[in-house]
Interface confidence: low
């Protein structure tokens, strides 16, 4: 033979202060017939929290429509929750008797505890930019949870990553909580376009972990690689010499041309172009004018890159006396 | 000019872990400015991108794969690896290597031949 | 994953037609599209990347266009030789993802 149970499947229920908890019962059987009533605590001194015939529940409404006979859901919702609302609740279901109902059965209990959400994570990053194969440190913080047990996750470009140091304080009882985390990432030459994740997962959030990010736009620097090239062709008395850097970053770039040692003040062509991995390249183009006294020209190309030390490339012109004594415009 | 060749058993287990390797001759995987990839081809189908390693180790993987998927990279021997466990005759593909520049012509502008690995008993 | 739709899924045409086949992505990938030559046994070749540029050593009759969601990828005059199947791949995202491709065939 079939026997009633009283289902109620959430052991421990976490609520925020002022919001509404939904304590669920079900019930597997509508015999024998009788009301099911909602209690907190258990004994002689349990406290009666709704009763559908008799009573004013204020802040109790029920989930499904009780009046209906075939109803099994005896689920309710307390508003407005409070410190004092903590507790452990039972449906009970009551056997119709005369002169007055017999307690038939309990269902095992819904612990409601207070809980708190953390806050948006924070993730901040190092202070000063460092270069790709360098490791960096990222840190994370979430504040006012409750309770204290929480899950917090890295992640780099959507990979989980295992480099970190995650604390929870305090360390005994507490109102709330904080979470403190540190990981430690390697960088990429294209990590001007990554992102550090920091993902922080706790049973108030019911399942949609709050997440902080850093670019490691912020800390990276990609240092440029320079090539100084005399172009074959010459236009009249004039080489032109070019100065490429490449896959720099952040943009922030000075460049200088040199002639034997003097630097030039003349205005140079340039363009700046963008690399798919945020990189940028800068092209820089200096006119020579050729002259038979102008036989050991030595051009330097000096590029300072966001505040570091200057770095320099050196070409010795190759100037022919073929080329010397060409007259038209453009001679290879 | 950089070339790649795949090479690993062409004939797998069910259940078993496919391995394959790609040797990269008149280039260095260390020297940078690319990454390794894995694209699979099933037969008569399209491309499947699998996952990518940098000569650093730093990898990324497809999402669909990626709780099977391994990418490996040994400089010294100028090789990189895929690894993909618990195969199913699925998994029966032409699995292609390539490098992946990171500026410049971003595509898989080095392709291996491709190697056929069916899986069956 | 970003969704490339390629059309039509096959095709045929005479040598010296204009072949046009067509991209499109599920969400903006800007320019961040290759196309791809596949032959019968081979591995794929890069014939266009960044959308609309011609890798070294590719004829010129091949072209690319296009931006954001939508990428046209041309033969301006058919020839034998082009007889292949054509991706398009995106890399703005990772994953990279491949279109279902285009068979193209001389009639």
């Known amino acids: 033979e079939e026997e009633l149970q009283m289902i109620q499947p959430e052991k421990l229920l976490l609520v925020t202060v002022g919001k509404t908890a939904t304590l669920h019962c079900t019930v597997t059987s509508l015999l024998p017939v009788g009301p099911v009533l909602w209690f907190r605590g258990v004994g002689p001194g349990r406290e009666l929290i709704y009763n559908q015939k008799e009573g004013h529940f204020p802040r109790v409404t029920t989930v499904s429509d009780l009046t209906k006979r075939n109803n099994m859901d005896f689920s309710i919702r307390i508003s407005s929750i409070t410190p004092a609302d903590v507790g452990t609740y039972y449906c009970v279901k009551f056997r119709k008797g005369s002169p007055e109902n017999v307690e038939f059965k309990s269902g095992p209990g819904t612990e409601m505890a207070l809980g708190a959400k953390p806050s948006a994570p924070v993730v901040l990053g190092p202070a000063a930019r460092t270069t790709p194969e360098h490791t960096v440190s990222f840190t994370c913080e979430s504040h006012g949870f409750s309770p204290r047990d929480i899950t917090l996750k890295w992640f780099k470009n959507g990979n989980e990553l295992s480099d970190f140091q995650t604390n929870v304080d305090p360390t005994g009882q507490s109102v709330a909580y904080s979470i403190r985390s540190t990981a430690r990432v390697v960088l990429d030459p294209w990590d001007v376009r990554s992102q550090v994740i920091c993902e922080v997962a706790h049973v108030t959030l019911q399942g949609d972990p709050l997440r902080g990010t850093a670019n490691l736009s912020e800390a990276i620097r990609v240092p440029p690689t320079l090539e100084v090239t005399q172009q074959p062709m010459r236009v009249g008395n004039q080489v032109n010499v070019t100065c490429q850097v490449r896959k720099f970053y952040p943009q922030s770039l000075q460049l200088t041309w040199s002639e034997n040692g003097n630097v030039c003040q003349r205005e140079t062509a340039s363009t700046l172009t963008e690399n798919k991995d945020g990189t940028y390249n800068w092209t820089s183009w200096f006119l020579v004018n050729i002259s038979d006294q102008r036989d050991d020209v030595v051009l330097t190309c000096q590029v300072k890159h966001d505040g570091q030390l200057a770095v320099s490339k050196r070409l010795a012109l190759e100037v022919t006396v073929h080329q010397k004594d060409q007259s038209s415009d453009a001679t290879p | 000019q950089v070339q790649l060749q795949e090479s690993g058993p062409g004939l797998v287990k069910p259940s078993q872990t496919l391995s394959l390797t790609c040797t990269v001759s008149g280039g260095s995987i260390s020297s940078g400015g690319y990454y390794w990839s894995w694209i699979r081809q099933h037969p008569g189908k399209g491309l499947e991108w699998i996952g990518y390693i940098y000569y650093s180790g730093s990898t990324y993987y497809n999402p669909s794969l990626k709780s099977r998927v391994t990418i490996s990279v040994d400089t010294s021997k100028n090789q990189f690896s895929l690894k993909l466990s618990s195969v199913t005759a699925a998994d029966t593909a032409v699995y292609y290597c390539?490098?992946?520049?990171?500026?410049?012509?971003?595509?898989?502008?080095?392709w291996g031949q491709g190697t056929l690995v069916t899986v069956s008993s | 994953d970003i969704q490339l739709t390629q059309s039509p899924s096959s095709l045929s045409a005479s040598v010296g037609d204009r072949v046009t086949i067509t991209c499109q992505a599920s969400?903006?990938?800007?320019?961040?599209l290759n196309w791809y030559q596949q032959k019968p046994g081979k591995a794929p070749k890069l014939l266009i990347y960044?959308?609309?540029n011609l890798e070294t050593g590719v004829p010129s009759r091949f072209s690319g266009s296009g931006s954001g969601t939508d990428f046209t990828f041309t033969i301006s005059s058919l020839q034998p030789e082009d007889i292949a199947t054509y991706y398009c791949?995106?890399?703005?995202?990772?994953?990279?993802?491949f279109g279902g491709g285009t068979k193209v065939e001389i009639k």
């Open positions: 791949q995106q890399f703005a995202y990772l994953p990279y993802t």
């Open positions: 960044d959308a609309s």
């Open positions: 390539a490098r992946e520049g990171l500026d410049g012509s971003y595509g898989s502008s080095a």
């Open positions: 969400q903006d990938i800007s320019n961040y």
